[in-house]
């Protein structure tokens, strides 16, 4: 039993860290492997994560890690029975992958604009709430060449879009993802898409 690609881990910096790794052959992750994790200081409690298969030889483990602070470092040990396959350190604050923005909705707005709104995935008391910036991808459902990317660097989770910048009568889809610049995070996963028809009148809520 050998690890091909060692665990790569990311934290949402609120409640969960996820590690993924690849074995050198198809593996029943939950039956054969365990990932133990603990805060790296003397006397800290050891926890065990039962991995799941993402693919034949790819395992993923979701670990509840609450109240992360910048200095926290976790010790990870990957076991196959009594055999230690791999060990390493993981600092959640250095490997942040934000939660996915939610509830992306498109509203008609004044002056022939569309108002795209979504929810910040973090509560106001969390460090990341005020750190997120967003990328919005707007694409024509019938023309792969017709797409636009908008960077939302202000705090509000909204984007105003002039209807005239989109083809009239075309169906468009939008999705949004987030990142936290000060944490040098990776991008979050994309939100589910929301679709609307770009027309000029009458204006109705979608």
């Amino acid at each position: 039993v050998k690890v091909l690609h060692e665990p790569s881990c990311f934290s949402d910096y609120i409640s969960t860290s996820v590690c993924q790794w690849k074995m050198d052959h198809p593996t029943n992750c939950s039956a054969e492997l365990r990932l133990s994790y603990q805060l790296d200081f003397m006397g800290s409690e050891n926890h065990t994560c039962v991995p799941e298969n993402r693919e034949d030889s790819v395992c993923v483990c979701s670990m509840p890690i609450d109240d992360a602070v910048e200095a926290d470092v976790y010790q990870l040990d990957l076991w196959a029975g009594q055999q230690l396959l791999w060990s390493g350190s993981f600092q959640p604050s250095k490997h942040v992958k934000p939660r996915t923005p939610g509830n992306l909705t498109v509203y008609p707005n004044i002056s022939h604009t569309w108002l795209l709104m979504w929810t910040n995935p973090y509560p106001t008391e969390n460090h990341l709430h005020s750190e997120l910036t967003y990328m919005v991808n707007v694409s024509n459902d019938n023309d792969p060449e017709d797409f636009k990317v908008y960077n939302v660097t202000y705090m509000g989770p909204t984007l105003r879009l002039a209807a005239s910048t989109l083809k009239s009568g075309a169906s468009y889809s939008a999705r949004v993802r987030a990142w936290a610049q000060t944490y040098n995070s990776t991008w979050s996963d994309w939100s589910p898409s929301t679709t609307w028809l770009n027309y000029y009148e009458p204006w109705e809520q979608h």
């Epitope: 050998k2 690890v3 091909l4 060692e6 665990p7 050198d24 603990q38 805060l39 790296d40 200081f41 003397m42 006397g43 800290s44 470092v73 010790q75 040990d77 230690l84 396959l85 791999w86 060990s87 390493g88 350190s89 993981f90 600092q91």
Partner: antibody, heavy 124, light 107 residues
Framework: EVTLVESGGGLVQPGGSLKLSCAAS????????MYWVRQTPEKRLEWVAY????????YYPDTIKGRFTISRDNAKNTLYLQMSRLKSEDTAMYYC?????????????????WGQGTLVTVSA | DIQMTQSPASLSASVGETVTITCRAS??????LAWYQQKQGKSPQLLVY???TLAEGVPARFSGSGSGTQFSLKINSLQPEDFGSYYC?????????FGAGTKLELK
């Protein structure tokens, strides 16, 4: 400049105990896994123990487990090896070594820095 | 545990010659292999890690190659300071293990 200086070696009877120390300087000690490696009189190199950067995790080969304890004091930049129930086959030069990269993983367990070693002789 | 087998156990060479030391792992260790040099009465010194990456300050006449189970360390144009013992060590997981060493002597 990275330096590792071991001390505490000496002659000890079988079944006895000894505590080795390693004073580290020239790098952020608390960022690194640290290891003890020994070299037998026949010049074979053997890994003895490792400890994680924060000291929360330790690991030993089966020949060592239950007899030796690795620990660290990050405030004092010092690594320790408490050896008990010593056997004649534990006779060796004991080296303190530093992991290749800060934090990192077991795949970074190559040793760019070694101390000068401290000799442990177990004999009646 | 992964066994590391080094060959030859010893060899004699002259200054200016090129020599190659080999190391075989009992199972696939990808490229996770380090080489060390040890001179009489001194601590080992890292030469190569990750199979072929030269450690800081190591002269370019040293080169590491190989992956999987077969590895080699080549020393071009031997210099007087190159004589001593050489050890390989895998760093693919726990426990790390070392080869028994190759003693390089002046002919």
């Amino acid at each position: 400049e990275v330096t590792l200086v071991e001390s505490g070696g000496g002659l000890v009877q079988p079944g006895g105990s000894l505590k080795l120390s390693c004073a580290a300087s020239g790098f952020t000690f608390s960022d690194y896994y640290m290891y003890w490696v020994r070299q037998t009189p026949e010049k074979r190199l053997e890994w003895v123990a490792y400890i994680s950067p924060g000291g929360g995790s330790t690991y030993y080969p089966d020949t060592i487990k239950g007899r030796f304890t690795i620990s660290r004091d990050n405030a004092k930049n010092t690594l320790y090896l408490q050896m008990s129930r010593l056997k004649s086959e534990d006779t060796a030069m004991y080296y303190c070594t530093r992991h290749g990269s800060p934090y990192g993983s077991s795949r970074g367990a190559w040793f760019a820095y070694w101390g000068q070693g401290t000799l442990v002789t177990v004999s009646a | 545990d992964i066994q590391m087998t080094q060959s030859p156990a010893s060899l004699s060479a002259s200054v200016g010659e090129t020599v190659t030391i080999t190391c075989r792992a009992s199972e696939n260790i990808y490229s996770y292999l380090a080489w060390y040099q040890q001179k009489q009465g001194k601590s080992p010194q890292l030469l190569v890690y990750n199979g072929k990456t030269l450690a800081e300050g190591v002269p370019a006449r040293f080169s590491g190659s190989g992956s999987g189970t077969q590895f080699s360390l080549k020393i071009n144009s031997l210099q007087p300071e190159d004589f001593g013992s050489y050890y390989c060590q895998h760093h693919d997981g726990i426990p790390v293990t070392f080869g028994a060493g190759t003693k390089l002597e002046l002919k």
